[in-house]
Interface confidence: medium
């Protein structure tokens, strides 16, 4: 079952003559990335990156395209012809293909200036808001323990003299995209939960992901 | 349909080295694995080393590690597998073939379809 | 390395009747996605080889369905259900599972 959504820079717009970064990225899911392709609104392919072998921009992109930052891609000196949709695929193991979508809007210099205007302040008023969110999730946070550790002093001498042995468990929930809390996370290794035989498969130098006649599967040639 | 043709038969001194092409025809040769196998006469087969051209990436079986350098020139659609170093035990039949591929996914030599026709290299004195 | 060591040698056969060959591996082929990396060749004399069988028991385009493989993990076998003329050569299984890839000794047929 494929968990895993892609998350886009979705609409963006840029000055001609000027550069901007598209960028993917797959969450909720395990799986391994063992390409991503990037595609132009004709589906001329712009560029690969493949996990061992590295990147490749295709010969007419060259002069214009450079790799990164991560998986995203980079367009330098915009021509008002790059206006259009550009997609990023995810070749995934063992989800198989996700497929991202980013429209960009290449602007003469004067509109992108004055869009860029509208926008800093925007982004300004989201950062303060995000702000005060945080502050007032502390406080209600903050607030909370202060009331369960007086409600927890007031019955723990009850407690002392019936004692079980149980612990009360807190069920914790995962934060949502863009709260403030935060949580000591550990770096996933290369080949996630996996372990053994099958864990040094992101190493391989050589792999088929075939659709037609296998469905969306990924082989693997081990080094090894 | 998807063909590969060889260059012609060699003979070559020990010592020296041999350079083999194989031209693809057909296909996609930039995301396709290129393989090569050789068999020496009366014997089976066994695998030298493959290259994607896309990444131009090679990887060698131990045994010609630091003899062979296998290349692809994605212009002309050629592979080249150059054998240095030739000894008579050197002398056999050259194949390459090509991997599975997929232009939007990728790669592989986890099967050989279609092979070249094979280039005899032959090594004496 | 995954030694791949196949069986009979030589198989002499009758147009007509079956005819069945073996291919053993030092290491399982299964790969965690359910593919057994191993592929079926046949030379015909004073030709290249040619692909009949990949990923275990998927036939090649062209082949015909005389042909089948099967078997999983380290022990797998080439099936012709009836042996006809053009089948003789010599016949080589391939492990892809790991580098290097490594072939079988190949087995002879060749008509009684």
């Known amino acids: 079952m494929m968990t895993g959504t892609i998350e886009t820079t979705g609409n963006i717009s840029a000055k001609k003559g000027g550069s901007v970064i598209l960028q993917c990225h797959l969450s909720s899911t395990m799986a391994q990335v063992t390409q991503v392709n990037w595609e132009q609104h004709d589906h001329s392919l712009l560029a690969i990156r493949n996990a061992e072998l590295g990147w490749h921009i295709y010969p007419a992109f060259k002069d214009r395209v450079a790799p990164g930052p991560g998986l995203g891609l980079t367009l330098q000196s915009l021509t008002m012809n790059d206006t259009g949709e550009y997609f990023c695929t995810y070749h995934t193991y063992p989800d198989g293909t996700y497929r991202g979508r980013i429209f960009l809007e290449v602007l003469e210099s004067s509109v992108a200036e004055h869009s860029a205007r509208f926008q800093i302040p925007l982004l300004g008023a989201m950062a303060m808001m995000l702000v005060v969110i945080c502050i007032a999730v502390i406080v209600v946070v903050v607030l909370a323990r202060k009331k369960k550790s007086l409600r927890i002093h007031s019955v723990e001498s009850g407690l002392q003299r019936k004692s079980t042995g149980q612990e009360e468990q807190i069920p914790s929930a995962p934060s949502p995209p863009g709260s403030c809390v935060q949580a000591e996370a550990a770096p996933a290794g290369l080949c996630g939960e996996q372990q053994g035989d099958d864990c040094a498969e992101l190493h391989d130098y050589f792999n088929v992901l075939s659709y037609r006649s296998l469905g969306s599967c990924s082989f693997f040639t081990e080094t090894g | 349909q998807v063909q590969l043709v060889q260059s012609g038969a060699e003979v070559k001194k020990p010592g020296s080295s041999v350079k083999v092409s194989c031209k693809a025809s057909g296909g996609t040769f930039l995301s396709s694995a290129i393989s090569w196998v050789r068999q020496a006469p009366g014997q089976g087969l066994e695998w030298m080393g493959s290259?994607?051209?896309?990444?131009?990436?090679?990887n060698y079986a131990q045994k010609f590690q630091g003899r062979v350098t296998i290349t692809a020139d994605e212009s002309t659609s050629t592979a080249y597998m150059e054998l240095s170093s030739l000894r008579s035990e050197d002398t056999a039949v050259y194949y390459c073939?090509?991997?599975?591929?997929?232009?939007?996914?990728?790669?592989?030599?986890?099967?050989?379809?279609?092979w070249g026709q094979g280039t005899l290299v032959t090594v004496s004195s | 390395d995954i030694v791949m060591t196949q069986s009979p040698l030589s198989l002499p056969v009758t147009p007509g009747e079956p005819a069945s060959i073996s291919c053993r591996s030092s290491q399982s082929l299964l790969h965690s996605n359910g593919y057994n990396y191993l592929d079926w060749y046949l030379q015909k004399p004073g030709q290249s080889p040619q692909l009949l069988i990949y990923l275990g028991s998927n036939r090649a385009s062209g082949v015909p369905d005389r042909f089948s493989g099967s078997g999983s993990g380290t022990d797998f076998t080439l099936k012709i259900s009836r042996v006809e003329a053009e089948d003789v050569g010599v016949y080589y299984c391939m492990q892809a599972r790991r580098i290097p890839i490594t072939f079988g000794g190949g087995t002879k047929v060749e008509i009684k």
């Open positions: 290259i994607i051209p896309l990444f131009g990436k090679a």
């Open positions: 073939a090509r991997g599975p591929s997929e232009v939007k996914g990728i790669l592989g030599y986890v099967w050989f379809d279609p």
